[in-house]
Amino acid sequence: NECPELQPPVHGKIEPSQAKYFFKDQVLVSCDTGYKVLKDNVEMDTFQIECLKDGTWSNKIPTCKIVDCRAPGELEHGLITFSTRNNLTTYKSEIKYSCQEPYYKMLNNNTGIYTCSAQGVWMNKVLGRSLPTCLPECGQPSRSLPSLVKRIIGGRNAEPGLFPWQALIVVEDTSRVPNDKWFGSGALLSASWILTAAHVLRSQRRDTTVIPVSKEHVTVYLGLHDVRDKSGAVNSSAARVVLHPDFNIQNYNHDIALVQLQEPVPLGPHVMPVCLPRLEPEGPAPHMLGLVAGWGISNPNVTVDEIISSGTRTLSDVLQYVKLPVVPHAECKTSYESRSGNYSVTENMFCAGYYEGGKDTCLGDSGGAFVIFDDLSQRWVVQGLVSWGGPEECGSKQVYGVYTKVSNYVDWVWEQMGLPQSVVEPQVER
């Protein structure tokens, strides 16, 4: 009743290993690390056979097949490169995930290297079986912004890609009789979120109630240069419109809002987010230079009343930008307190512009980002949003533009976007 001698499979072993096997002896076939027992096209960890009464084995010895991790999962905004020849996906093969640079960067500077494990899953030393995350890079235009020479009133044409975060927000309120249409600017914060001023997205009511426009009435254009040619731009509808809950129409305090886009936009040379600042109650330091872009009025001789009566005829076709210094808070407060009317400059605002006038933001630039270059991170950071100005025409002497101090709202912004700050560390000014 002796059974024939057994040969262990290639890359495998049999236990117990004996010189002879008799009736009722059992043998367990297993494979080396990185291999699986294959019997009748079924993979298993071990396989047991028995020596039968008639001196035959209950089954043939199975084979050992190398573990295959199969094609790795797709990475959103990322690429996969195979380190092993012939793009092998078997045990100990290596792949490397990378993000679509320069528009996306891997979270936490992960190596992106994954190895096919003995269990048949792609494993990373830090993330385990989880895929890495490609986050949008912020504040790094593909085209270098110009050197801040002194001297969008008094502005100049922006080259395409110079302000890749710039969004044109068009609101067409069809619930109004007659239909109401206006526009403003915004800044891309991520592939799905636009930062803007609350007054841009407040329904233009006949009273001072703060009610947001319906999301159906909002269209956002990104990668736009010339408003006459929207063919190259990405346009998106809004999934959500979020005004700051404390926005005050009487003094424009808390003039900040967000638009969540219906679909994430693909990033590229003309569409890239701007960075958010650190939570910083002081805001940008006096005399720091910043840039603002917009399609607002670029003619310094046009009065506000003419702008309002002529609709959109006085707007710029090509994106304009201007360079402005931050004005000391006390100086700005004083300049507005000397005017008749409710012109309070709160701690949630800062001013920018020149005493002598000539350069300013204007109607239609509302909601646009006032960006400052951060030397530490070498990125452009949104420190302000175009909010309001004095009663005189834009660019008047000693009439500074007033901006929402974004650094006071960083927590609110992250909260609305539903992202814990730790996850979005690369998005924050360092």
């Epitope: 006949r206 009273d207 001072t208 109630t209 009610i211 129409i249």
Partner: antibody, heavy 114, light 112 residues
């Protein structure tokens, strides 16, 4: 077309309550607020308050804070105004309006009499 | 609270003549940010709800005849009917919407 249809006239005794309804049609009910205004016989217009159906926000004229309660039922596109502790001086025509007073209900006469 | 005062209380004007109603507010209705005056004018005929004529002090509501015009800024406002028609006989109210809402006491316009 836009319409605001109010409930019919009511006669109530002093101390009682009354609930007036205003059913909206022809526009998206949640996109605009509903205002309530009253007009006593031979008198002028007085604003009572407003409600925003999208988030149930309300604002009241101080004079009516303890008198009127505004609610909405978005499933039936209907706004309600409940008046409590009625007195003879609450006898008036009560109007609802929407789309910033572009459209008005026909008015509901509430008479308070013992 | 903002108080609205209309003058005169009543006005008799011949057909085809100009009718002018004034409205004064206890504080400015001009919002320095939006650059709008939050004042509206309404017309009310007997047994009917009010009808909006003018908003933002001077913007005519859709469908309102151009003989109706509004002017003024800050605290002083005027409604003008350039050529009174028989169908214009009504009570006219101003209303502020700068801070909640307050109506004026009304001005009755009749034909002389």
């Amino acid at each position: 077309q836009v319409q605001l249809v109010q409930s019919g006239a009511e006669v109530k005794k002093p101390g009682a309550s009354v609930k007036v309804s205003c059913k909206a049609s022809g526009y998206t009910f949640t996109t605009d607020d509903i205002n309530w205004v009253r007009q006593a016989p031979g008198q002028g217009l007085e604003w009572i308050g407003w409600i925003y159906p999208r988030d149930d926000r309300t604002k009241y004229n101080d004079k009516f804070k303890d008198k009127a309660t505004l609610t909405v039922d978005t499933s039936s596109n209907t706004a309600y105004m409940e008046l409590s502790s009625l007195r003879s001086e609450d006898t008036a025509v009560y109007y609802c309006s929407s789309l910033e007073d572009t459209y008005w209900g026909q008015g509901t006469l509430v008479t308070v009499s013992s | 609270d903002i108080v609205m005062t209309q003058s005169p209380d009543s006005l008799a004007v011949s057909l085809g003549e100009r009718a002018t109603i004034n409205c004064k507010s206890s504080q400015s209705l001009l919002n320095s940010r939006t650059r709008k005056n939050y004042l509206a004018w309404y017309q009310q005929k007997p047994g009917q709800p009010p009808k909006l004529l003018i908003y933002w002090a001077s913007t005519r509501e859709s469908g309102v005849p151009d003989r109706f015009s509004g002017s003024g800024s800050g605290t002083d406002f005027t409604l003008t009917i350039s050529s009174l028609q028989a169908e214009d006989v009504a009570v006219y109210y101003c209303k502020q919407s700068y801070n909640l809402y307050t109506f004026g006491q009304g001005t009755k316009v009749e034909i002389k």
